[in-house]
């Protein structure tokens, strides 16, 4: 062992008599990575690719099978390499990934399944990003492959990269797959997610479209209060506060059904907290609640504000920031 | 949780044969290599080979080539260890040791060891 | 093959001692290498992967370090349950090689 090569002198040693690789097997396991080196074609290598991730190599061997590779295709591996790199894809960085032009659907998927159960590397994200652009746009089926890998995948992407979202795809994104997205992302795809369940009965479109309705504007709300839809307040403290303000009291009311009494533990939170400050006082106390409101109150102490919402919402509004 | 169960102590006589058994359960089988591992009484530990669950394919420690044989069978998530021809040496705790497939090299989880007592 | 020498062989120390374990490689092994403790008629149990990746459910007392071809397993405070014998295991390269072992008693 102690006379082996160093790194610089690999590629001038030749390789031992009797160890030139026919075929990419177990045995290479135990070749030093001199021999790998020296011992083992480039071309055999790409030819039987799909052997490589059978063979327990170490992750030096695995790096002088990347170098072999490197040194065969320059611009770039071809598709055909690429779908067998097993993971040998792990030891891959982006700018190697960038040169790939991957096309086919089993080969990311064969990928991402080397990856499986770990977050999205910085080269797992590059080969998502050259594939989406290659194909166009984020259709169903990519969709479904990258969102059952990674289900925080979608909130991954930018509003402008979302907009390439056909509203075909939609189908395949499951509630979970939206849980971290932001309102941005959802202005974007909730108006697909409309059109895309349109043709679905009330209750039906209603259990599809709820967890889009963060990007949901005022008058779709106001259309959902008209359908008993039953709407949970986990749903509701998502919903945009632009878009729950112009709501009236009856409106809320018949949009949360059983739901509206979450609001009282809500009352101090946006978007209830803002709209509660809304609301006339007389309407708030229809509920049963206890909601305290500003406007047109019978039972408000700040008599001089009463007239003067304006002013009267910034009082009451500090006024429940210093409770907080 | 992960499980590597095996097979109970054996005593043999030099020159016969011994096949220790290391059922896994508890994750994908066919996801994970697995190597045997002995370690002689109050001595250290010595790599044996390694096994793919989900090809089959084998490596062995060249001390122990010709004399072992690492088999699997999927459908009971069993791997076995033949060890032939043996010598009193061979008296040894023998251990399956799992290594995740990405790394192959170090062992994550191991079974609670089979005994051979080679003896005449 | 790559021999893995670990020093001590014996270590005596008492509980809350701070102890280090050395294992020394015949030749450069990069970070591939795993640390063990094991128990009299126990298996290994993992504690530390890639030089000085802690595996999980390992407390936090224990740590490795080094790279190349030293490396040094460190328990900050000794507790009464980790006397036990210890091993290094390098998997640079096949075959798979470990240390001698140090065996860690009570004082």
């Known amino acids: 062992d102690a006379a082996q090569p160093a790194a610089s002198e690999v590629e001038k040693t030749a390789c031992p008599s009797g160890k030139k690789a026919r075929e990419i097997d177990e045995s290479l396991i135990f070749y030093k990575k001199w021999e790998l080196e020296a011992c083992v074609d480039a071309a055999l290598l790409a030819t039987q690719m799909d052997r490589v991730n059978a063979i327990p190599f170490t992750y030096e061997q695995l790096d002088v099978l990347k170098h072999k590779l490197d040194e065969l295709y320059p611009q770039g591996y071809p598709e055909s390499v690429i779908q067998h790199l097993g993971y040998l894809f792990l030891k891959m960085s982006p700018e190697d990934i960038r040169k790939w032009n991957v096309t086919s659907l089993e080969t990311l998927k064969a990928l991402l399944e080397v990856n499986k159960g770990h977050e999205m590397s910085p080269q797992v994200a590059t080969l998502i990003d050259r594939f989406v652009k290659g194909r166009g746009q984020l259709d169903k089926d990519t969709l479904d492959t990258l969102t059952a890998f990674y289900p925080g995948y979608l909130c991954s992407l930018s509003p402008e990269e979302l907009s390439s979202v056909p509203p075909s795809s939609i189908w395949a994104v499951r509630p979970q797959d939206l849980d971290t997205c932001d309102p941005r992302q959802l202005d974007v795809l909730y108006p697909k997610a409309r059109l895309a369940f349109q043709n679905m009965n009330g209750s039906e479109y209603f259990v599809k479209i709820q967890s889009f309705l963060g990007g949901a504007p005022t008058e779709d709300l106001k259309a959902l209060s008209q359908q008993n839809v039953s709407m949970d307040l986990a749903t509701f403290m998502k919903l945009r506060t632009d878009a729950v303000l112009p709501l009236t009291v009856a409106e809320v009311q018949k949009l949360l059904g059983p739901h509206v009494e979450g609001l009282k533990a809500e009352e101090r939170h946006r978007p209830v907290r803002d709209w509660i400050l809304r609301q006339r006082q007389d309407d708030l106390d229809t509920l049963g609640l206890g909601l305290q409101g500003t406007r047109g109150s019978h039972h408000h102490h700040h008599h001089e504000f009463r007239h003067d919402s304006g002013l009267n919402d910034i009082f009451e509004a500090q006024k429940i920031e210093w409770h907080e | 949780q992960v499980q590597l169960v095996q097979s109970w102590a054996e005593v043999k006589k030099p020159g016969a044969s011994v096949k220790v058994s290391c059922k896994a359960s508890g994750y994908t089988f066919t996801s994970y290599y697995m190597h045997w591992v002995r370690q002689a009484p109050g001595q250290g530990l010595e790599w044996m080979g390694i096994i793919n669950p989900s090809g089959g394919s084998t490596s062995y420690a060249q001390k122990f080539q010709g004399r072992v044989t690492m088999t699997r069978d999927t459908s009971t998530s069993t791997v076995y260890m033949e060890l032939s021809n043996l010598r009193s040496e061979d008296t040894a705790v023998y251990y399956c040791?799992?290594?995740?497939?990405?790394?192959?090299?170090?062992?994550?989880?191991w079974g609670q060891g089979t005994l051979v007592t080679v003896s005449s | 093959d790559i021999q893995l020498t670990q020093s001590p062989s014996t270590l005596s120390a008492s509980v809350g001692d701070r102890v280090t374990i050395t294992c020394r490689a015949s030749q450069s092994i990069s970070s591939w290498l795993a640390w063990y403790q094991q128990k009299p008629g126990k298996a290994p149990k993992l504690l530390i992967y890639?030089?000085?990746s802690l595996e999980s459910g390992v407390p936090s007392r224990f740590s490795g370090s080094g790279s190349g071809t030293e490396f040094t397993l460190t328990i900050s405070s000794l507790q009464p349950d980790d006397f036990a014998t210890y091993y290094c295991q390098q998997y640079s390269s096949y075959p798979l090689t470990f240390g001698g072992g140090t065996r860690l008693e009570i004082k």
């Open positions: 040791a799992r290594s995740p497939r990405v790394t192959t090299g170090y062992f994550d989880y």
């Open positions: 890639k030089a000085s």
